[in-house]
Interface confidence: medium
């Protein structure tokens, strides 16, 4: 029931943070127009990965798609590189967790296939969520370095000038959307590998074989615990599975004198 | 190199319509908003209309809204300006001006300046 | 009705310096709403000097420059030249997809 709890719960956050990865890849306020030094600016500068926008005072709004590849920073490339490939694992993820998850039954898939999958989207979501965060840090430390040389300018190169025109950037609604996405998504992730240890099915590390000893009937019980017919070395109900580590062999390679196959 | 050419003007009278066009030719006419303006003789520069770069935005001046509709055909790199009831106030040398805001540089900057202009077409409305 | 002024007509001696303005009948002028300017000689079409301010358009001289004086937009022209003789309009972005230029000043090199 934890397990699936676990699953569960990893799916959906995982969803969320991808829902809000891309919901970041697409918003226009990476960076916005800082206004220390303006707060009543008329228009008001914003920009995305894909576009740059102004709006005005009156509510005008105009945005412009960056036509060249060519002309913009290699780090912009980079950064949407990053959430792009954050949003195509991350979809992947959910499309292979929602065949691995416990409470959905596709035809007879073993629940050790279930396992592998569940562990698969968990690795898939946790490369997203560094995707996305990667991508957002980049993008942040690019805004912090230009802010800085920006406000290095505005004292230095404009002189006598009674008002300038230097314009500061500064972090956007994005970006925090970003990093809280990308985070949720690297915690889904850790949550479905956190579930794939559980959902690893003890069954499945031997076989459930009936051992016959004279006038007693010995077996093992899928407890993990040798049923103990009251003698020989049995009396102690030794524990022979301990968590899968041992192979099916090993786990029947110690028979008492009573036992036969 | 980058070039406007006006024409379609000429002597019309007062009601009627007439279509400037402005060719373009030297850059990515579809990345660019258009302009209008017009020079009545003797007198100063007045902005009549503006186009966005897709023709998803228009807007007029005043003293022509709901008379002179702009359009924009970036197949034929084409600008164009369609008047109707015509007046004779409306006689003056028209230019088509291109609107310089679409930068290579990240970010973009919006600079709502009119860097390129046409040699100008007159249009006379008298009867 | 929002009114964009500048001096009808102004003088200057070769060499010497002038600042044209660019005012609102209604309010101040700020970066806010881009001023540029340009120069036309009688028969020929507009050629953009300044643009946002204080940008110069390619091929422009740095004896023009733009700059906001009190709640002015200004044009300053430093070591004037005869062929600066002409006519110097400023346009101001209203917001909104509206542009509006100003009367012009005709600028005369004695």
């Known amino acids: 029931m934890a397990v699936t709890a676990c699953q569960g719960l990893g799916f959906v956050v995982s969803l969320i943070g991808i829902a809000g990865i891309i919901a970041a890849t697409c918003m226009d306020q990476w960076s916005t127009q800082d206004l220390y030094n303006n707060p009543v600016t008329a228009v008001f500068n914003y920009q995305g990965l894909w576009r740059s926008c102004v709006r005005e005072s009156s509510g005008f709004t105009e945005c412009r798609g960056y036509f060249t590849l060519l002309g913009l920073p290699a780090m912009l490339q980079a950064v949407r590189a990053l959430m792009i490939v954050g949003i195509v694992l991350g979809a992947i993820g959910l499309l292979v967790s929602i065949f691995a998850l416990k409470c959905i039954r596709i035809g007879s898939m073993e629940d050790s296939a279930k396992a592998n999958m569940t562990l698969t989207s968990g690795i898939m979501f946790i490369v997203s969520g560094l995707c996305a965060i990667a991508g957002v840090s980049v993008f942040a430390n690019m805004l912090v370095t230009n802010f800085w040389m920006s406000t290095a300018n505005m004292y230095t190169g404009m002189g006598g000038m009674v008002q300038t025109v230097q314009t500061r950037y500064t972090f956007g609604a994005a970006l925090f959307v970003g990093w809280v996405a990308g985070g949720l998504t690297l915690i889904g992730g850790v949550m479905m590998c956190i579930a794939c240890r559980g959902l690893a099915p003890e069954e499945t590390n031997y076989k459930a074989v009936s051992y016959h000893a004279s006038g007693h009937s010995v077996a093992y019980k899928p407890g993990g615990f040798k049923a103990s017919t009251g003698f020989g070395s049995n009396t102690k109900n030794k524990k022979i599975y301990d968590g899968g580590a041992r192979t099916e062999d090993e786990v029947q390679s110690y028979p008492s004198k009573h036992d036969y196959v | 190199q980058v070039q406007l050419v006006e024409s379609g003007g000429g002597v019309v009278q007062p009601g009627r319509s007439l279509r400037l066009s402005c060719a373009a030719s030297g850059f990515t006419f579809s990345s660019y908003g258009m302009h209008w303006v017009r020079q009545a003789p003797g007198k100063g520069l007045e902005w009549v209309a503006v186009i966005w770069y897709d023709g998803s935005n228009k807007k007029y001046a005043d003293s022509v809204k709901g008379r002179f509709t702009i359009s924009r055909d970036n197949s034929k790199n084409t600008l164009y300006l369609q008047m109707n009831s015509l007046r004779a106030e409306d006689t003056a040398v028209y230019y088509c001006?291109?609107?310089?805001?679409?930068?290579?540089?990240?970010?973009?900057?919006?600079?709502?300046?009119?860097?390129?202009w046409g040699p100008g077409t007159t249009v006379t409305v008298s009867s | 009705q929002t009114v964009v002024t500048q001096e009808p007509s102004f003088s200057v001696s070769p060499g010497g310096t002038v600042t044209l303005t660019c005012g609102l009948n209604?309010?101040?002028?700020?970066?806010?709403?881009?001023p540029s300017w340009y120069q036309q000689t009688p028969g020929q079409a507009p050629r953009t000097l300044i643009y946002?301010?204080?940008t110069r358009s390619s091929g422009v001289p740095d004896r023009f420059s733009g700059s906001i004086l009190g709640n002015k937009a200004a044009l300053t022209i430093t070591g004037a030249q005869a062929d600066d003789e002409s006519d110097y309009y400023c346009?101001?972005?209203?917001?909104?997809?509206?542009?509006?230029f100003g009367g012009g000043t005709k600028l005369t090199v004695l």
């Open positions: 946002s301010t204080n």
């Open positions: 209604s309010g101040s002028v700020s970066t806010s709403y881009y």
């Open positions: 001006a291109r609107r310089y805001d679409v930068l290579t540089a990240y970010p973009y900057y919006f600079y709502y300046n009119m860097d390129v």
């Open positions: 346009v101001l972005y209203m917001g909104s997809g509206i542009w509006v």
